[in-house]
């Protein structure tokens, strides 16, 4: 399927609108600091060039690879060295090393200002004045802040963003119509970004085999009626799509994702009975819908797994003939029977099974050796079940904010070297598992909770990788993808940690806290809590809770005061002195 001109091929497949949007996303994900106008100019230049190649595929440079064309274009940016420092050195390299170099410089936590939402009327005016620029700006701002955002899915978000403004800017109460929609898009967008980040980390840090194993387990749960060969085909195609997107090949990725959606819909009879509604939707909605589709019902009367994977005399023969295929079949069979297990648990079981076969198939009596392999699964299954039960009980007792605080204390004591903003962000997200998953019945709790925790802990891992400060975090992040959560759960208080020196500035607050949203105010309090634990890691839960209540009383008092700033200055000093006296800070 070789094309004379790759850029012409993708332009024709995707259409001009999607082509331009995807090139903008690609450029913004690579050059995260560049102004919007510069990116638009580069995109227009690439688009004009693509059109010349569509007209004549033999035209000059049309035969070049997309990486070459895009890389050359990025390297024309005049301020590359001043803005990006050593990333400019990438431009001295040849493809494919140049693209790899750009990928390595993607920043998960770019130093960009927080996106502040303007007044609704201001946004509606901007939308009406220039809809195209308004929507491009959305793509640009999201892409540069989330350099691994799944590009074809971002097109779907942009479509919903446009629909929200189209509808709400005509409504009687624009704000009541628009703001909840924007909140929903923001929250879904953050979740989508984090989920995709885990897929890319899985591919980049643990390799294609790890990603394929994840995909076999997840797709087998989702499509339990599909044959193993069908699931394997879907896994191969899905792996290609995500490898491309994670590698910055966004045009190929979007094109292949569309092909995969088409294939799934054409073959839904042999895949799942739940796809009908998805397959009636337009392309972007269809792909999104398929990715989120509920698990199909399990086929009735599935035989016991033991027959093929424990009792059969051919276990070692089948394993030796094609190890990964046999393990893939095991994973497929186990996963389709267990929609109640998390994907990471299924992968742990498969790993245990693999380890047992590796050992036993070399033993004198292999069958005797592996006969009890399923017994080894019991503690692996019970560990997340118990953990989820305990934490859901705690969540129900405390509510989300105080559950987050409990996790903040727990994780700060485990890894106190990690930066305070990272601990706050990660612990707040870990705490959201309660509202997200504890409402589910037992059969849905584990896949909801543990797979969500994998996504959140990956955020910790990628943020920590940028500036590593804790050997314990590095160890849990790098040793095993599927055991990250158990590794973090098993960490106790870091006894080697030398408490942070007390700094009064850290605990100085101002009247601006009074005008913050409830969420922002919570973050301020949680930041103080992390700092408190870093200063006093031996403080008991009760002491920390009491000091935080003093802090709440202080904020409440000063926010009611006539002279708020004076109150914060004077009472703040008293609060610090009182806490120092009580905790011996």
């Amino acid at each position: 399927d070789a094309h004379k001109s790759e850029v012409a091929h993708r332009f024709k497949d995707l259409g001009e609108e999607n082509f331009k949007a995807l090139v903008l996303i690609a450029f913004a994900q690579y050059l995260q600091q560049c102004p919007f106008e510069d990116h638009v100019k580069l995109v227009n230049e690439v688009t004009e060039f693509a059109k010349t190649c569509v007209a004549d595929e033999s035209a000059e440079n049309c035969d070049k690879s997309l990486h070459t064309l895009f890389g050359d274009k990025l390297c024309t940016v005049a301020t590359l060295r001043e803005t990006y420092g050593e990333m400019a050195d990438c431009c001295a390299k040849q493809e494919p090393e140049r693209n790899e170099c750009f990928l390595q410089h993607k920043d998960d936590n770019p130093n960009l200002p927080r996106l502040v939402r303007p007044e609704v009327d201001v946004m509606c005016t901007a939308f009406h004045d220039n809809e195209e620029t308004f929507l491009k700006k959305y793509l640009y701002e999201i892409a540069r802040r989330h350099p691994y955002f799944y590009a074809p899915e971002l097109l779907f978000f942009a479509k919903r963003y446009k629909a929200a403004f189209t509808e709400c800017c005509q409504a009687a109460d624009k704000a009541a119509c628009l703001l909840p929609k924007l909140d929903e898009l923001r929250d879904e967008g953050k979740a989508s970004s984090a989920k995709q980040r885990l897929k890319c980390a899985s591919l980049q840090k643990f390799g294609e085999r790890a990603f394929k194993a994840w995909a076999v387990a997840r797709l087998s749960q989702r499509f339990p009626k599909a044959e193993f060969a069908e699931v394997s085909k879907l896994v191969t195609d899905l792996t290609k799509v995500h490898t491309e997107c994670c590698h910055g090949d966004l045009l190929e990725c979007a094109d292949d994702r569309a092909d995969l959606a088409k294939y799934i819909c054409e073959n839904q009879d042999s895949i799942s009975s739940k796809l009908k509604e998805c397959c009636e939707k337009p392309l972007l909605e269809k792909s999104h819908c398929i990715a989120e589709v509920e698990n199909d019902e399990m086929p009735a009367d599935l035989p016991s797994l033991a027959a093929d994977f424990v009792e059969s005399k051919d276990v070692c023969k089948n394993y030796a003939e094609a190890k990964d295929v046999f393990l893939g079949m095991f994973l497929y069979e186990y996963a389709r029977r267990h929609p109640d297990y998390s994907v990471v648990l299924l992968l742990r079981l498969a790993k245990t099974y693999e380890t047992t076969l590796e050992k036993c198939c070399a033993a004198a009596d292999p069958h005797e050796c592996y006969a009890k392999v399923f017994d080894e699964f019991k503690p692996l299954v019970e560990e997340p079940q118990n953990l989820i039960k305990q934490n859901c009980e705690l969540f129900e007792q405390l509510g989300e904010y105080k559950f987050q605080n409990a996790l903040l204390v727990r994780y700060t004591k485990k890894v106190p070297q990690v930066s305070t903003p990272t601990l706050v962000e990660v612990s707040r997200n870990l705490g959201k598992v309660g509202s997200k998953c504890c409402k589910h019945p037992e059969a849905k709790r584990m896949p909801c909770a543990e797979d969500y925790l994998s996504v959140v802990l990956n955020q910790l891992c990628v943020l920590h990788e940028k500036t590593p400060v804790s050997d314990r975090v590095t160890k849990c992040c790098t040793e095993s993808l599927v055991n990250r959560r158990p590794c973090f759960s098993a960490l106790e208080v870091d006894e080697t940690y030398v408490p942070k020196e007390f700094n009064a500035e850290t605990f100085t607050f101002h009247a601006d806290i009074c005008t913050l949203s409830e969420k922002e105010r919570q973050i301020k309090k949680q930041t103080a809590l992390v700092e408190l634990v870093k200063h006093k890691p031996k403080a008991t839960k009760e002491q920390l809770k009491a000091v935080m209540d003093d802090f709440a009383a202080f904020v409440e008092k000063c926010c009611k005061a006539d002279d708020k700033e004076t109150c914060f200055a004077e009472e703040g000093k008293k609060l610090v002195a009182a806490s120092q006296a009580a905790l011996g800070l």
Epitope: Q543, A546, A553, K560
Partner: nanobody
């Protein structure tokens, strides 16, 4: 469950002093802030003072600031309210309360356990 018992109320002249005590038993005492509230006939229960968990930080209602002092002795599970320069408008039933896990520090709804109250009457 916590039992709180106030004592020390009585009838005094304007300008006099009284010291209220509140003895706690049951649930952990030292981990929670304690509050003093009062309720005059026909009025809402109002905040008077909050004494933090360690006794190192005290907040007062503007109407009593400079005249009343809250303190606590965690070894004795007791909280105190020293009331000086009493005025007739200080007449009320005084309650001590233990802080709950949520809600405002300056509102009765933010406190979980309550004593039965002690009457303070200030005559002119």
């Amino acid at each position: 469950q916590v039992q709180l018992v106030e004592s020390g109320g009585g009838l005094v002249q304007a300008g006099d002093s009284l010291r209220l005590s509140c003895a706690a038993s049951g649930r952990t005492f030292s981990g929670y802030a304690m509050g003093w509230f009062r309720q005059a006939p026909g009025k809402e229960r109002e905040f008077v003072a909050r004494i933090n968990w360690s006794g190192t930080l005290t907040y007062y209602a503007d109407s009593v600031k400079g005249r009343f002092t809250g303190s606590r002795d965690n070894a004795k599970n007791t909280v105190y309210l020293q009331m000086n320069s009493l005025k007739p408008e200080d007449t009320a039933v005084y309650y001590c309360a233990q802080r709950g896990d949520s809600g405002s520090n300056y509102d009765p709804s933010g406190y979980r356990y309550w004593g039965q109250g002690t009457q303070v009457t200030v005559s002119s």
